[in-house]
Amino acid sequence: KEESSNQASLSCDHNGICKGSSGSLNSIPSGLTEAVKSLDLSNNRITYISNSDLQRYVNLQALVLTSNGINTIEEDSFSSLGRLEHLDLSYNYLSNLSSSWFKPLSSLKFLNLLGNPYKTLGETSLFSHLTKLRILRVGNMDTFTKIQRKDFAGLTFLEELEIDASDLQSYEPKSLKSIQNVSHLILHMKQHILLLEIFVDLTSSVECLELRDTDLDTFHFSELSTGETNSLIKKFTFRNVKITDESLFQVMKLLSQISGLLELEFDDCTLNGVGDFRGSDNDRVIDPGKVETVTIRRLHIPQFYSFNDLSTLYPLTERVKRITVENSKVFLVPCLLSRHLKSLEYLDLSENLMVEEYLKNSACEDAWPSLQTLILRQNHLASLGKTGETLLTLKNLTNLDISKNTFHYMPETCQWPEKMKYLNLSSTRIHSVTGCIPKTLEILDISNNNLNLFSLNLPQLKELYISRNKLMTLPDASLLPMLLVLKISRNTITTFSKEQLDSFHTLKTLEAGGNNFICSCEFLSFTQEQQALAKVLVDWPANYLCDSPSHVRGQRVQDVRLSVSECHR
C-alpha cells in the first residue's frame, strides 16, 4: 500500500523523464522500469537510501533528491549508476560523506552536496574518480568549517565550483590549488579572515571569481605570500558584500595584484561610507590595470546624501569601456567624472533617478567622448525634447535606450546627436509619433505605448518594433523603404493583404500575431495559400487567431475554413 501511495505522486513520460517532487514519498519508488533516464524526487520525505533502491535504474542520467531529509546512504547505493550525469543531494541531513558513493559514477558531470551538515568533505578524496565532473557544489552555512588539502584532489577542470564556506575556520594551504582550471568559482564566506590565504591558491586557476555574503568592513590587504603574478582571473564579482570606504581601498589593492583582470562586478552590496576612498596610506596610487568593464547593481549606500568628492576614483576610470550602474539611486554623475571616462563606450544607468536637468550636468561639454551606447531605462525623464537636447554633447552616441520613462507627449521637432542609429522609446506612454524621431535611425522600438497611427518617413530604418499599441493597419511601406524587420503584434489590426506585404520590398521578418483578425475569405485565402508567408511571419501560425466571424473566434487563421456560401454572398 505504501508503495502504491509512493507511486501515485510520480509521473513519467515516454522519454523516461519521471517527476515526483513535492509529494509525500518516503522511499525511492521501486516499480519503475529500467528505461528511466531522469528521476526528480525533490521535496519529499525520503530519509534512507539502500543498496537496492536504485540498482535496476542502469540508464539513469539525472537523479534529484534535494530537500528530503536523507541521513543515510548505504555504501553501494549508486553502484549501478554508471551513466548518471547529474546528482543533486543538496539540503539533506548527510553529516558524513563517503567516497564509495561516488566511485561508480564515472559519467557524473554535475554534483550538488550543498546544505548538508558535514564538517569536512570526508576522510578520503571524494571526487578523485569523477574525471568528467564539470559542476560541483559543496559546503553549508554553519557546520562546514574546514577545507583540507585532499578535498579536491583528482579534479583538474571544472566549469563551476561553488563552496559554501560561510563559517570556515580552517583552510589548509594549497587545498584549492590542486584544481588546474575553474571557469567560475563561487565562494560564500561570512568573514574575510581566510580570504587572502584562499585567494593565493586561486589566482592561477580561476577565471571568474565570485565572493558572496562577506563582511569586508574590516578587510585589510597585506602583501600576498606568493611570487606568482601570472593570474588567470578575468572577472571578480562581489555579491551581497559589505564594504566601507577604507576597506574598498584595501580591496582595490588586492585587485591590483590580478594582472589580467578585465571585469569587476558588485551586486547587492552595501557601502557604509561617504565616498572617501583615499585610504590611510593615500600616498599609494592604485593601478586599475586592464579593467574595462565595471558593473554595479542594487548598490545600497546608507549615507548616500553625505557623499564626499569622488575625485580619488577619477584616475582609475580612464581606461574603462563599459559601465553599468543599475538600480542604485543614482541621480547625478559628476561632470568631472564624465570627462575622465575617456574610453567609455557603453553606459547603463537603468532604474535610477536621473532627470533631464541633472543629466545635463552629467553630459556636460567633453563628457563621455567615446560613448556609443547610453541606457537610461526607467529613470525620471519626462521631456523628450529636453532629453535629446541634453545629449547633444555626445558626438559619438549611436544607441539610446530611454524606455520606461514617462514622456506622454512628443514635440513636433527635437534635436539629437547626429549619429543616432538606435532609439528605444518603448513603455513611455506616448500617444503619437512626430518628426521628433531622428531621421538617421536604423532601429526604432516604440512598443507598448498608446499609438494608433504610424506615418513617419524614416528612410534608413531597418527594424521597427511597434507591438502592444493601438494600430489598426500596417504602416505605409513607402515611408520605410529599407525595412527588414517589422514587429507589430498585439495591436488592433484586422487584416493585411498580399499587396501590402509586397510593398515592403526588403522585409525579411514580420511578427503580426495577437491582432484582431477579421477572417474574411480574402484574408484566409491569401494567408493559407502563400507558402512563402511562413518564412516571413515568424510567429505563424500559433499567434494568428480569428476575432471574427464570431463562430470562428479564437481559432487559428491557418485552420479556419469558411463555407462556399459564406464566401460567395
Epitope: F331, E357, T406
Partner: antibody
Framework: QVQLVQSGSELKKPGASVKLSCKAS????????INWVRQAPGQGLEWIGW????????NFNENFKDRATITVDTSASTAYMELSSLRSEDTAVYFC???????????WGQGTTVTVSS | DIVLTQSPATLSLSPGERATLSCRAS??????????MQWYQQKPGQPPKLLIF???NVESGVPDRFSGSGSGTDFTLKISRVEAEDVGMYFC?????????FGGGTKVEIK
C-alpha cells in the same frame, strides 16, 4: 495624471498610534520614492522620512526614527506612515509627496490632519 | 543638520512689483556642480507646490515669472512681476544632507 490621495482626518489620544495612507496613481509607483512631511498648525514643514517602493529601503529624520514606520503595498500602489507614542506636539497636517530625481518633491497629497488630544 | 534661514519673514508688494526672496544655508548644499536647493509655494489650506529644483530649474507648468538662482549657501527666488495669485508662503528646502530640512518660510502678500 499623477495623484496622491491621502486618508481622512484622525483624532487620537496621547500614547496611541496612527497609521496614515497615501494612494498613488498616474505613474509607476515602484519607480519613485514616497516622502512624508508634516506641518504643525501655523508652522513650517518638517521632513519625516522616505521609502523607495522598489526595494523597500527607508530613511528617517532622527527625530522620528524611533516612532515612525513607513511601509508600502506595491500591489495597491499605496504608502503608509505609522507614528506611535503620540503626543500633543504631533498634532499637524501630514503630507505624502512623490520624490523625483532623488532630491525634490514634485507632487503632494492633499494632507491628513492628525489631532492628538486627551 | 543644515539650517535654512529665509528672509524676509513677510514681503508685502503691489501687483507688478518684483519680489526677491532669500534663503541662506548653514553649510554648502552643492553636489558636484549642482545645488540641491528647492523652492515651494504653499497657499492656505493646500499642500506645497514645487516651483524650482536644483536651485534654478523651473518645474514644468510653473509660470516663467518665477526664477531661482544661487549656489553654495546663498539662494534667491525671484518673481519678476507679482500677481494676486502669488500670495502665500514660500519655503526653501535642501536635499544635500540628511535630514532634509526646510526654511521657516517667507509670506508674500499683496498690498
Amino acid at each position: 495624471q499623477v495623484q496622491l490621495v491621502q486618508s481622512g482626518s484622525e483624532l487620537k489620544k496621547p500614547g496611541a498610534s496612527v497609521k496614515l495612507s497615501c494612494k498613488a496613481s498616474g505613474f509607476t509607483f515602484t519607480t519613485y520614492g514616497i516622502n512624508w512631511v508634516r506641518q504643525a498648525p501655523g508652522q513650517g514643514l518638517e521632513w519625516i522620512g522616505w521609502i523607495y517602493p522598489r526595494d523597500g529601503s527607508t530613511n528617517f529624520n532622527e527625530n522620528f526614527k524611533d516612532r515612525a514606520t513607513i511601509t508600502v503595498d506595491t500591489s495597491a500602489s499605496t504608502a503608509y506612515m505609522e507614528l506611535s507614542s503620540l503626543r500633543s506636539e504631533d498634532t499637524a497636517v501630514y503630507f505624502c509627496a512623490r520624490l523625483t530625481g532623488g532630491t525634490f518633491l514634485d507632487y503632494w497629497g492633499q494632507g491628513t490632519t492628525v489631532t492628538v488630544s486627551s | 543638520d543644515i539650517v535654512l534661514t529665509q528672509s524676509p519673514a513677510t514681503l508685502s508688494l503691489s501687483p507688478g512689483e518684483r519680489a526677491t526672496l532669500s534663503c541662506r544655508a548653514s553649510e554648502s548644499v552643492e553636489y558636484y556642480g549642482t545645488s540641491l536647493m528647492q523652492w515651494y509655494q504653499q497657499k492656505p489650506g493646500q499642500p506645497p507646490k514645487l516651483l524650482i529644483f536644483g536651485a534654478s530649474n523651473v518645474e514644468s507648468g510653473v509660470p516663467d515669472r518665477f526664477s531661482g538662482s544661487g549656489s553654495g549657501t546663498d539662494f534667491t527666488l525671484k518673481i519678476s512681476r507679482v500677481e494676486a495669485e502669488d500670495v502665500g508662503m514660500y519655503f526653501c528646502q535642501q536635499s544635500r544632507k540628511l535630514p532634509w530640512t526646510f526654511g521657516g518660510g517667507t509670506k508674500v502678500e499683496i498690498k
